[in-house]
Every structure is written in structure tokens, then in C-alpha cells.
């Protein structure tokens, strides 16, 4: 339950988050599980711990193994395990299955491909995107924040997409790549079980106390006009309007994008003046149509909840 798979390529940066959360946490200690040897926190080391993050800058094949994180507080110590595998870079262009993140689907226009794990890194735009090892060029491709937008998607756009970015740590730059498959849906009009494009299931969104935060629930329901389709947010299983917190509001009216017939809906949840108690709430993005309901849960976490003095 408290174990997580992570993978990366040799000579690239890899950052792994401890799968356990503190309630609260005072410190997080990391160990090599096999030897029980403590991982240093000094940044001069190639592999070092930084609060809830374990950083490989850069990673080596020999780093593969299971790492233990212990979230410590006066009351309880909570243990998690990160199963890390570092692979050699392939000489050819094929990205093996074991390096692939989850597949995403799109259709026709405005399909988004999110760059996996990027939120763990200190990166600056723009991202570089590749398809089957070729750099993407042309006006149909737009790198926007942490995702790629493809306009007028065609069947030929299906394939493996790699995002590449630079992680900066104390002035030193490290390359990171991540690959996921993109599939293109059928051209005819159809209705399908809702597909939530954002947020990811069990996504943890970092927010700053006192600042505003936006969460976007984005889902697609098929192609062509949909008889019934809706996206909405719930707080702890309660409709926003019934929850009774005026700081937290849904954007009036849903954005409807008929991307060459693909019916997608967005609903933005706006949280004004984020408070501590907001971190305890469960935020559910719900997408529903005649096929049924799909729910993705988002949690908020305070930026750098452990490393307060950095």
C-alpha cells in the first residue's frame, strides 16, 4: 500500500516522492532498504534526500533498488518504500514498455498530453516534445506549461510522445525525459464512458497558504453532440453549492469544446485565500454521462511542507 514504482534513465535527473504523508511530519529520513544505510542530506552528494523528496542528480543504473522513507513526528513514524529502477539509455529510438507512463487518448483538435512527473522538478518552460524521437515542429504543436497541445488531431498522430526538460538544482542543470503513448479515437460520432484528462487520479496539488488556487476538471465524453454530459467538483462528497464555503467556487458555466466533434468539458474550481483547513478536504472531479460516472480525487498539499527552513 505504501510502496511506489519509480523509474528513470541513467545520467538523467530522477526525483522520487515518499509515498507516505506525515500528519504532521517533522523530518523525513531516507535509507537504502537492503543495507539500512542512511541517505545523506548534503546536496554535494549525487544521491541525496531533501525532505520528502529523494534526488538522483544524475541517476546511475547502480542506484536501482528499494529505498525506505520514514516520516517522523513525535507521535508516529510512518514508513514508505520507493522501488526505483534506473535503465541504460537505448541506442535506438524505441522506448520500451517499462519506461512508459500511462497512455492518454485524444481526438481531432486540442488534445492535451501532460508531461509525467514534471511537478516534482524545478524546471522552466518551454518543454521540448518529441514523437518517435523526432522533435515536433509546426503550428499544430504547442508546448503549453506542462503539456503539449495538438490541434486537428489525426490518426497518424498516435504514437509515443517524449517530453524533455531541464531540472535546475543549485545552478546545475540536469536533463529529464518522460514518455507516454497517445492514442487517437475513432472519427465517427460516438459516446463513451467519461475520460478525465485532468486532474490525474490521486493527484497532489501543491498550493501556498494565503494565495489563490485553481483546479481544473477536464473530461471528454465522445465525439459529436452528447445527449447528457457534465463535469463538476465535489468537496468531501458534497456539491460545492451545498458545502457552504464562499471562498471555494466553481466557475459559472462549463467550457464546452467541440474539438472537431470531440465533446470535452472543463470546470474550474477556484479557491480564494487558501487556508490550512483546505488541505484536509477531498476534492473530487466528477465526469458523468449516460454510460456512468468517473471520479478523480485531488488532494492539496502545502508547498515544501517539511523543509520549512530552506
Amino acid at each position: 500500500k505504501f510502496s511506489k514504482q519509480s523509474w528513470g534513465l541513467e545520467n538523467e535527473a530522477l526525483i522520487v516522492r515518499c509515498p507516505r504523508q506525515g500528519k504532521p511530519s517533522y523530518t523525513v529520513d531516507w535509507y537504502y532498504s537492503q543495507t539500512n544505510k542512511s541517505i545523506p542530506t548534503q546536496e554535494r552528494n549525487r544521491v541525496f534526500a531533501s525532505g520528502q523528496l529523494l534526488k538522483f542528480l544524475p541517476a546511475a543504473v547502480a542506484d536501482s533498488g528499494i529505498y525506505t522513507c520514514i516520516v517522523r513526528s513525535p507521535t508516529f513514524n510512518r514508513t514508505g518504500y520507493a522501488n526505483v529502477t534506473i535503465y541504460k539509455k537505448q541506442s535506438d529510438c524505441n522506448v520500451p514498455d517499462y519506461l512508459m507512463y500511462s497512455t492518454v487518448s485524444g481526438s481531432e483538435k486540442n488534445s492535451k498530453i501532460y508531461c509525467p512527473t514534471i511537478d516534482l522538478y524545478n524546471w522552466t518552460a518551454p518543454l521540448e516534445w518529441f514523437k518517435n524521437c523526432q522533435a515536433l515542429q509546426g503550428s499544430r504543436y504547442r508546448a503549453h506549461k506542462s503539456f503539449l497541445v495538438i490541434d486537428n488531431v489525426m490518426t497518424e498522430d498516435a504514437g509515443d510522445y517524449t517530453c524533455k526538460f531541464i531540472h535546475n538544482e543549485n545552478g546545475a542543470n540536469y536533463s529529464v525525459t518522460a514518455t507516454r503513448s497517445f492514442t487517437v479515437k475513432d472519427e465517427q460520432g460516438f459516446s463513451l464512458f467519461p475520460v478525465i484528462g485532468a486532474p490525474a487520479q490521486n493527484e497532489i496539488k501543491e498550493v501556498e497558504i494565503g494565495k489563490n488556487a485553481n483546479l481544473t476538471c477536464s473530461a471528454c465524453f465522445g465525439k459529436g453532440t452528447q445527449f447528457l454530459a457534465a463535469v463538476l467538483w465535489q468537496l468531501n462528497g458534497t456539491k460545492i453549492t451545498d458545502f457552504g464555503e464562499p471562498r471555494i467556487q466553481q466557475e459559472e458555466g462549463q467550457n464546452q469544446s467541440f474539438s472537431n466533434g470531440l465533446a470535452c468539458l472543463d470546470m474550474v474550481l477556484r479557491i480564494a485565500d487558501v487556508k490550512e483547513e483546505d488541505l484536509l478536504l477531498q476534492y473530487d472531479c466528477l465526469a458523468l454521462n449516460l454510460h456512468g460516472l468517473r471520479r478523480h480525487t485531488v488532494r492539496l498539499s502545502r508547498k515544501n511542507p517539511i523543509d520549512h527552513h530552506s
Partner: antibody
Framework: QVQLQQSGPELVRPGASVTLSCKAS????????MHWVKQTPVHGLEWIGA????????VYNQKFKGKATLTADKSSSTASMELSSLTSEDSAVYYC???????????WGQGTTLTVSS | DIVMTQAAFSNPVTLGTSASISCRSS???????????LYWYLQKPGQSPQLLIY???NLASGVPDRFSSSGSGTDFTLRISRVEAEDVGVYYC?????????FGSGTKLEIK
């Protein structure tokens, strides 16, 4: 909005046991430790112990070991504290209090008044 | 156990003026992570305690910025810049550095 709703006042005989409850709402129950605090005019606020509802793990103030037993029911988001072998010294207001990811005692119940008297 | 010491009463203050409440711990509350685990709570008459300040100097959500706190590892001061009638109650300091967590005996804010 986070709420901790505690059970009503109790009047019990010396030597008996009593169970106080605390129902949590407005947040994910297993994501917050539940602590219990005793308040009397003589000793002020005293920390009794805590439970992690996710695992059922407990930790106690040495002073209250054998006196208090903490439990949590995930299905009903309710934490409970049983107090045994009651004496007049146990007469007090008892609070449940929840933690956040950053600190303990962030949210407090309204308190349960326990009176031990023959 | 860490002992938290407070005076039972504050010096009486006039509404609109500032007030200070002191607290001392028997051991430094500075953790190796650089955080001082000192907390301030206010218990208004007939109510439960409510968190004012966490980790020595951080204002809890919804607490007016009239409240501030400072100190070293063992000596702490809660300051209320412009006392209002609603600030009346007992102020407790507490430590969350180590078990058992302990509270001060409380300081009652008195209005002239």
C-alpha cells in the same frame, strides 16, 4: 468546514467505565491524527494520547496509560476514548483535537464534561 | 517532561492598547529541522481552545494579524497589538517538540 462533534455530558459512578466519542466531518478522517486532552481547574490542559485512524496505532502519555484506551472507526469517522476504573480525579472536560499536515491540535471538539460521583 | 511556565494573570490592559503574554519552557523547543515547536492557544469563556500561533511565529488560519509571537528556544512572548474585547480569555502556550505534549497553566488576559 472541519467539525469534531463530541458526545454529551456523562455522570458515572466511581469504579465504572465510560466511553466518550468524537465524530469527525469536513475532512478525510484517516488523514489526520486524533488527540485527546483533559482539562481540570487544578491541572489545566493535559495531553492524554493520540491515535492514527489509518493504522489504529496509538500513543499515550505515561500518566494515562491503563486509564485511557483510544480507538477509531474508519467507517463512521468516529474516534473514541474509554476511561476505566473511574475516580473523582477523572472528573474533567475532555476534548478531542485533530491534526493537520503541519501541526497538532488544529481543530477542537466542543468538549465532553465527565462527572464521577457516587 | 518539558515544563511550560506562564504567569496566571497578565498586566491589565486598556482596549486598543497592546498586551504581552510570556511563556518559558524548561528545555529548548528548537528541533534539528530548524523549527521551534511552540504553540499559542486562546480559550474564550465557555469555549474550546483555539489555535492562534503555530511553530512559534506562524499565524493560524483566520487569526487576525494583531497577534504575533516571538522568542528564543526557551523564552517566548505573545503580543496583541490592539486589544479588542473579543480577545478576553485564557492564553495557553504549548510544546509539540516531544512526548508527552505539554501545556502552560494559562495566562488570563485582564482588561482595565
Amino acid at each position: 468546514q472541519v467539525q469534531l462533534q463530541q458526545s454529551g455530558p456523562e455522570l458515572v459512578r466511581p469504579g465504572a467505565s465510560v466511553t466518550l466519542s468524537c465524530k469527525a466531518s469536513g475532512y478525510i478522517f484517516i488523514d489526520s491524527e486524533m488527540h485527546w486532552v483533559k482539562q481540570t481547574p487544578v491541572h489545566g490542559l493535559e495531553w492524554i494520547g493520540a491515535i492514527d485512524p489509518e493504522t489504529g496505532d496509538t500513543v499515550y502519555n505515561q500518566k494515562f496509560k491503563g486509564k485511557a484506551t483510544l480507538t477509531a472507526d474508519k467507517s463512521s469517522s468516529t474516534a473514541s476514548m474509554e476511561l476505566s476504573s473511574l475516580t473523582s480525579e477523572d472528573s474533567a472536560v475532555y476534548y478531542c483535537t485533530g491534526s493537520t499536515t503541519d501541526y497538532y491540535f488544529a481543530y477542537w471538539g466542543q468538549g465532553t464534561t465527565l462527572t464521577v460521583s457516587s | 517532561d518539558i515544563v511550560m511556565t506562564q504567569a496566571a494573570f497578565s498586566n491589565p490592559v486598556t482596549l486598543g492598547t497592546s498586551a504581552s503574554i510570556s511563556c518559558r519552557s524548561s528545555k529548548s523547543l528548537l528541533h534539528s529541522n530548524g523549527i521551534i515547536y511552540l504553540y499559542w492557544y486562546l480559550q474564550k469563556p465557555g469555549q474550546s481552545p483555539q489555535l492562534l500561533i503555530y511553530q512559534m511565529s506562524n499565524l493560524a488560519s483566520g487569526v487576525p494579524d494583531r497577534f504575533s509571537s516571538s522568542g528564543s528556544g526557551t523564552d517566548f512572548t505573545l503580543r496583541i497589538s490592539r486589544v479588542e474585547a473579543e480577545d478576553v480569555g485564557v492564553y495557553y502556550c504549548a510544546q509539540n517538540l516531544e512526548l508527552p505534549f505539554t501545556f502552560g497553566s494559562g495566562t488570563k488576559l485582564e482588561i482595565k
